[in-house]
Each structure stands twice: as C-alpha cells, then as structure tokens.
C-alpha cells in the first residue's frame, strides 16, 4: 500500500486550509459542509464543542464562548501590549496565568481556561479530520504556516498545537515562503529572485519580500498592518446599510446584536460577490422587527466606502521595499495571498503601483498558501510523482457558455446544446475612456444575469493602449475542443497582445439535475430576468460613473490640471446624484439612465479636456459604440452593438 | 450673447415628417444638454425629453417614445428634432432650451401645423 | 413619474398686490445629500418663449426682480409675487427636476 500522504495546514487567524498532494498535484480539501476553508473559531456550549463553520454560525448566540483570533495569542506573554490591545474587542475573557494568556468560558456548565495552543489545536484537529475524511485513512505528518514576522516563540507554540493535536509536525513554514512554492518560483532556475508576497486575509495584511536562489528563501522585509482585513471591509459595509435601513426604515439596528451579525453574514457575502460581479443583492427576512431588508451594492460604492482602507495597503508596500533595500523596478515576481485580493480595486492598486506588472493570481488566494504547504509537506515525505492533468469529456455543451459584460450582463457565445468541438468569436470593446484591461469572466447558465449563473474562471488581458470607450476592439474566442477542454482567449486587435484561460475540469461544475432545473427556471424568469437586468445595468452604470467622477477629480494627479470651478461642478452633480441615488434604488431604468446622462453632460466635457492633446477622447469622442450602459468600475468588458 | 434660434414655421400633411432644428450660439454647444418642448395651442407646457449634445444620447418622455427622435450636429452647433407620421394632435409650437439644472435659454419656438 | 399640481389655474390680483402660486409634488423633490429642493418657476408671457425665474426653489435667475421669489420644500412649493406689475401678467409654470422633467399644467395671473 502506498504511504500515507502528508498534509498542509494553513493555520489563519480567521480561516484555516489544508491540502495535499498526491496524484501529482495539490488537492485542496472542502469541509464537510463544502467549503475549501474552515473558520479558525472554536464555541463551547452548554452541551458540546463546536468547530469551524458550526461555531462561526452561532457566534450571534454565544459571543463570550465562541473563541477566534487565538493566532494572535499563541506564543505571547498576557503583558504584550498586542494582547492587551486585542482584549479590548474580543467578546469572550482573556485571563492571566503566570503571564500567559488563557481564554475563560463557559463549557457544559463550567469555567474552563484554555491555552491559545489548545485552542489553536482544536482548528488543526479539525483541519486534520477534515483531510483524513477525504483521504480515508488517518494522518500525522503535516506542514504548518506561519506568518514571516512570528517568533521563535510563537513558531514553537505553534508546533506545540501540532502535537496537542496529534501531529507529527514536520516542518513550520513561513506563510509567505509557502505561496511563493506554490507558484513554483523556487523552480524557475532564473538565478536569484526577489518576490512580494501581498497577503490581505480575514484579519490581518501581511507584505513579505522573499529573495530565492537555488531554492533557498530568504526573508528580506516583512510589513503590514495586523489590524487589517476582509472584516474591516465587512465593517464599512455593515456600517453602510446600517444607516440605509436608518433612512428607509427609520429605525437603528446598531445596538441588536443578532441583527447586526444577521446583516454581517450577508455583507461579507456581498463583498464575495462584488470580487467577481459589479453588483450583490442582499436578501435578509425579518431583520429587525419584521422588517425585510431587501437591498444592494455595487462594486463602485463598495470600493468607495474602503477607499481609504484599500489605499493604505500601499503604504506597507513601500516599507518593505524601503527596508529590503530594493526599488520596485527589482522585484521579479507579485504573488497575492488572502481572500481580500480578490477583491479588484486591490489588484489593480497593487498592479498600478508596480506599473501594470502581472500578478500571480492564479491559485485561489485564500489557497496558495495551504497550496505551498501541500507541496512542501510532499517534498519532505519524498514524493517525486508526474504531474496529472483532469480533463472534462462531454459530446455537447450542457449549458450555455459566455462572459459578463457590463452591468453584470451574461453575454452567451456557445449557445447551450452546440455540439463540440465548437469555436465562436466576438468582438467586445472597453466601458471606460482610456481603460488599460478588461476582466473576462467566464460563465455557463442560461440567466440574463451573470449573478444567476455559474463562475468557471476569470483572467485580464491588460496593456490596451489608451483610447475612448467603445474604441478598442477585444476579440474573444471560445473554443472547447473534442475533450471538452475550454479555451477563452482575448486579443486586443490593436496590438495583437492576448490572454487565455483553460478550463478543463468539473469542479463547481454542475451536475445534470441542476442544469435540468436552471434551463426550466431561466425559461421562468427570462422575462423578467430582462427588465431586472437593464434596471440593474442602468443603476449600475450610474453609481460607477458617478464614483468614478468624482474618484477622477479628487486624483492628486489632476492637481493643477482641472480648474477649481470645474472641481466643484463635477464634484457637486456627483454629490447631487449619489445622494439620488441613495433615496431611489427602486427607480426605473429610465430615470437611472437620464441622471447618467445629466451627470456624463457635466463631467464628458470637463473631463475629456484633461486628456485633450493627450490622445484623449474629445467631443464626441465615443464613436458608433458610445456609451451603453453598465458598470465602470474595474476593467469592464463590454459587447459591440 | 447666448442664442438659440429656431427654424421657421411649418403646414404638414398627416403621415408626413417633419424636422426641427435649433442653432445655438454664444457657448460651447457640447458643454449643456438641450430639451425640447411642446406647447399645444391653448395648453400647457410637456417636457418631450432632451439629447446630452456630448455623447448625442436622447432621452424621451413617456408620452414621446416612438415617432420622435432627438440629434445633433456638434459642427454646426444644431440639434434637431424629428417628427414622422405627423397626426392632427401633434399641431403645437415646439420650444428647445439649453439645460443646466434649469432651461436658462429657449428657443423662439417653431409652429408646426398638421393639417389634411 | 412625478406628477405637478398647480394652484389656481388662474388668479386676478390688483397692481401692487401679491400673488401667490402653489404646487405640489406628487413625490419630496429634496435631495437629502445637496439638501436641494429640484424645483423651478418659468414665467411666459403671450406669445412669448417661457423665461427661467427661479431654480432650486428659491434662488432667483439673475436680471429677475427681488418681487418674485419661491419658498417651499419637500412636496408643497410656492412662488410669491410681492407687489404685481403689469408686465407680470403671464402664465407661471413650476417644473421638477428631482427625476426626468415634468411641468405644473400652469397658472395665469391677470390684473384684476
């Protein structure tokens, strides 16, 4: 019998992954409620022990017995001036023993007092259970991350939860060393290589600069902000429609505490969502007082709202760089880690700082660095296995495949049932003046809405020159070959620059039942799937334009360049717009088109006169294919009428 | 000075077009939206919709989607209003009005008699 | 769509006396965020194209005299003429731009 494969742990301060490898490649493992993460959460009840996904959900219900953030703990005397800050806003008690941190609940009627190792241990048994479910037989040997920064003791507290959870620890790993092997830049055989590693998780930001040679890591500069994260972003969303309830409901839901973690639930999946659409709803029954609470949020008033937070994750950038001694010039190679770098506007912040260098993206981020652990857990164990590739065979299209275009529009090329191997192409242009990349994701469904519909890969092609909206012309092809194998490729036909995606497997690929019963409700809905999604776009359209207006005249660039008056004039038709906007989510599409238009009549004018000599757009610069509708916000693709 | 002159007054058959035009001058004619409005013999005034003169994008009233359509020519600082399958009813003075906020400038108005 | 009602349809007041026009909005014409009511009074005179008086409920067009001005907020808006004149003699419209355009059916005002 083969041996036993050995597992990597990625062991987070709000989530933790595990994955191994076998078969030639890393596999990383869902839960048993199918998720590809675990929340790093432990609850004590008055009957049992929860862990992970049970003891996040009831954390409303139990909050002084519902234990997180332990990664914060481990390893650190109860005086560290990071515990005591911590305690401040933790539900649950932090007491004193011999200067070491314990946490106190409540467990089946008692006080009990926890180590952070113990706690921490809890997760890693989960997160071993987890592996052995999937892999059925039992594991011991596992690799386990932590952050670059951690100590020499916090690493041997780490260890330790390794062993209370019945681990054979083979190695700690740093978590950033971790996503660079990932990524295989330990292999690329280019000499010494210096790697950013930008990880924004749940809880924490991390900025590691790593310098590989001949496979040998060196830490060079850590940086980031351990207070910084995908909660905080939750944070302005649930303060956001805090105060939208407060306006059409006249009510404040801030002090009902189960309300408020109800609409936490639905915010974070909202930003989820806005990562690959420019529009989430959030349905929540019953949110306060019988209210129903039935809204949305565009991607553009969400990066609005984290502006602030999402610029700040330049700052520790530029440390880090300071402290490695390194221009940006110098780093070879960007490697995003975290679940908040999906997020668009962080991508494109950090890829405009390193003036449009790719990144690497193409491991799941909140995965990379379990990924890494995988690998490196395999390399320890002696594994020297081929590479396997999966492949998807199929003789006709079950569902129809296509990309969004703007507003969240599902724009079909295979049509559902062509038989294959099939190849379609069209030709899309940008939404926004001067756009430098259009994002192409790629969905099957049959809905008018890509928010319906099934996500099956994205990529950018980056790099379009300059030039009005409506005016490039992006060829994408959709091409599934005899095995099913789907390959999208754009190409800017004005310089021949192209990108591509293969889709070869069925994972989050649906099963025949469902795609039966999406093509019997897309049928359903198709009505009135269409007057929602031109309402949609409309609204869309608007609240991106007006953001990015008013994003445009506030650049510190355009200092000097734009008039006062003109600042003003832009500044205030925003104003007077968002706040329309605000009041009217319900309005029609016509009302939300007619206000993009008084709006675009204000700014087009002002704005295009930056760019006049430039190469800008001037009057009437938008061409057949002007302005349609749809969300400006990140790179959005758009179809040519 | 600012101005907005209008063509003149026009005796059309029922199922015939006719088109309006609107000559602005004294401003950059691509920096304000322009409106246009009917006013029926005895009645009130109706908001037929307006064109954004940057982007050439109109937009139609409720009452007047359909046989109207709204264009410019930003060379000539023109924009026009076009009417097809005239009917008895659309017998009325049709105002343009340059657009920033509020209509601060009309045109003299243009009568258009539908008539067998 | 916002529907505009106009009070009186007509009104006779003697020279030198006010007049006072009312409308109401089917819909507040506040905007929360510019603390702006979107609502504006044209005057017409016979034969004539109709003039811009007053926009944003009370701020008065330039070259307008300090007689008219307008008050109001939310649904109910009025345009006040302190002192008539003969030239004021004219239909009044007000006119809402909170969302699309639509015109109050107008009110005359004759010298009595």
């Known amino acids: 019998m083969a041996k036993a494969a050995a597992i990597g742990i990625d062991l987070g301060t709000t989530y933790s992954c595990v994955g191994v490898f076998q078969h030639g490649k890393v596999e990383i493992i869902a839960n048993d409620q199918g998720n590809r993460t675990t929340p790093s959460y432990v609850a004590f009840t008055d009957t049992e022990r929860l862990i992970g996904d049970a003891a996040k959900n009831q954390v409303a219900l139990n909050p002084q017995n519902t234990v997180f953030d332990a990664k914060r703990l481990i390893g650190r005397k109860f005086g560290d001036p990071v515990v005591q800050s911590d305690m401040k806003h933790w539900p649950f008690q932090v007491i004193n023993d011999g200067d070491k941190p314990k946490v106190q609940v409540s467990y089946k009627g008692e006080t009990k007092a926890f180590y952070p190792e113990e706690i921490s241990s809890m997760v890693l048994t989960k997160m071993k259970e987890i592996a052995e479910a999937y892999l059925g037989y039992p594991v011991t040997n596992a690799v386990i991350t932590v952050p670059a920064y951690f100590n020499d003791s916090q690493r041997q507290a780490t260890k330790d939860a390794g062993v209370i959870a019945g681990l054979n620890v083979l190695r700690i790993i740093n978590e950033p060393t971790a996503a660079a092997i990932a990524y295989g830049l330990d292999r690329t055989g280019k000499g010494e290589r210096n790697v950013l590693i930008f990880d924004l998780g749940g809880g924490t930001f991390d900025v590691s600069i790593l310098t590989i040679d001949d496979g040998i890591f060196e830490v060079k500069a850590t940086a980031g902000d351990t207070h910084l994260g995908g909660e905080d972003f939750d944070n302005r969303l649930v303060n956001h429609f805090v105060e939208e309830f407060k306006r059409k409901h006249k009510k404040d839901i801030s002090q009902n505490k189960r309300a408020v973690r109800r609409l936490r639930t639905a915010c974070e999946r909202a930003k989820r969502t806005l990562s690959s659409s420019t529009q989430a709803s959030l349905e929540i029954d019953s949110l306060f007082e019988g209210i129903d609470f039935y809204t949305s949020i565009t991607r553009a008033r969400f990066e609005e709202l984290c502006s602030d937070l999402f610029r700040s994750t330049l700052e520790p950038v530029e440390k880090a760089l300071r402290d490695a001694k390194l221009d940006k010039a110098q780093i070879h190679d960007l490697v995003l880690v975290g679940g908040s770098t999906r997020i668009p506007k962080v991508q494109k912040l950090l890829q405009d700082f390193f003036n449009g260098r790719d990144l690497n993206k193409s491991i799941n981020p909140d995965e990379a660095v379990a990924y890494g652990a995988a690998v490196q857990a395999a390399i320890l164990m002696g594994d020297k296995s081929e590479n396997v590739q999966d492949l998807l065979l199929l003789d006709v299209a079950p569902l129809s495949l296509g990309l969004e275009t703007a507003g969240g529009v599902m724009t079909a090329l295979i049509k559902r049932n062509s038989t294959i191997p099939t190849k379609q192409t069209q030709i899309f242009t940008t939404y926004s003046d001067n756009q430098p990349g259009v994002l192409i994701q790629v969905y099957e469904g049959e809905r008018a809405m890509t928010k319906d519909n099934n996500l099956l890969g994205r990529f950018e092609l980056s790099g379009i020159p300059p030039a009005p909206r409506g005016v490039p012309q992006i060829e994408v092809t959709f091409d599934i070959d005899a095995n099913g194998i789907l390959n999208v490729t754009a190409t800017d036909k004005s310089t021949g620059k192209a990108n591509k995606i293969t889709i070869t497997n069925d994972k989050g690929r649906l099963s025949k039942e469902e795609i039966e019963r999406m093509v019997q409700e897309a049928e359903k809905y198709k009505a009135e799937d269409e007057v929602q999604r031109e309402r949609v776009s409309a609204k869309n359209a608007l609240e991106s334009y007006a953001f990015n207006m008013k994003s445009a005249v506030e650049d510190e660039g355009l200092k000097g360049k734009i008039s006062e008056a003109d600042k003003k004039k832009v500044l205030d038709k925003c104003q007077e717009v968002i706040s329309w906007l605000d009041a009217n989510t319900l309005a029609e599409k016509d009302e939300f088109e007619h206000k993009r238009k008084e709006l675009e009549q204000v700014c087009n004018p002002i704005i295009s006169g930056l760019y006049q000599g430039a190469g800008g757009p001037g009057p009437g610069g938008f061409g057949a294919q002007g302005p349609k509708g749809g969300s400006g916000s990140g790179p959005t693709i758009e179809e040519v009428d | 000075q600012i101005q907005l002159v209008q063509s003149g007054a026009e005796v059309k058959k029922p199922g015939a077009s006719v088109k309006v035009s609107c000559k602005a001058s004294g401003y950059t004619f691509t920096n304000y939206g322009m409106n246009w409005v009917r006013q029926a013999p005895g009645q009130g005034l109706e908001w037929m919709g307006w064109?954004?003169?940057?982007?050439?994008?109109?937009t139609y009233a409720d009452d007047f989607k359909g046989r109207f359509t709204f264009t410019t020519d930003t060379s000539t600082s023109t924009a026009y209003m076009d009417l097809r399958s005239l009917r008895s009813d659309d017998t009325a003075v049709y105002f343009c009005?340059?657009?920033?906020?509020?209509?601060?400038?009309w045109g003299q108005g243009t009568l258009v008699t539908v008539s067998s | 769509e916002i529907v505009l009602t106009q009070s009186p349809d007509s009104l006779a007041v003697s020279l030198g006396e006010r007049a006072t026009i009312n409308c109401k909005s089917s819909?507040?014409?506040?905007?929360?965020?510019?603390?702006?009511?979107?609502l504006a009074w044209y005057q017409q005179k016979p034969g004539q194209s109709p003039k811009l008086l007053i926009y944003?409920?009370?701020t008065r067009e330039s070259g307008v005299p300090d007689r008219f001005s307008g008050s109001g907020s939310g649904t109910d808006f009025t345009l006040t003429i302190d002192s008539l004149q003969a030239e004021d003699v004219a239909v009044y419209y007000c006119k809402q731009s909170y969302t699309l355009y639509t015109f109050g059916g107008g009110t005359k005002v004759e010298i009595k």
């Open positions: 944003w409920t009370s």
């Open positions: 009005a340059r657009y920033d906020h509020y209509m601060d400038y």
């Open positions: 819909q507040s014409l506040l905007n929360s965020g510019t603390r702006k009511n979107y």
């Open positions: 064109i954004n003169t940057y982007t050439g994008e109109p």
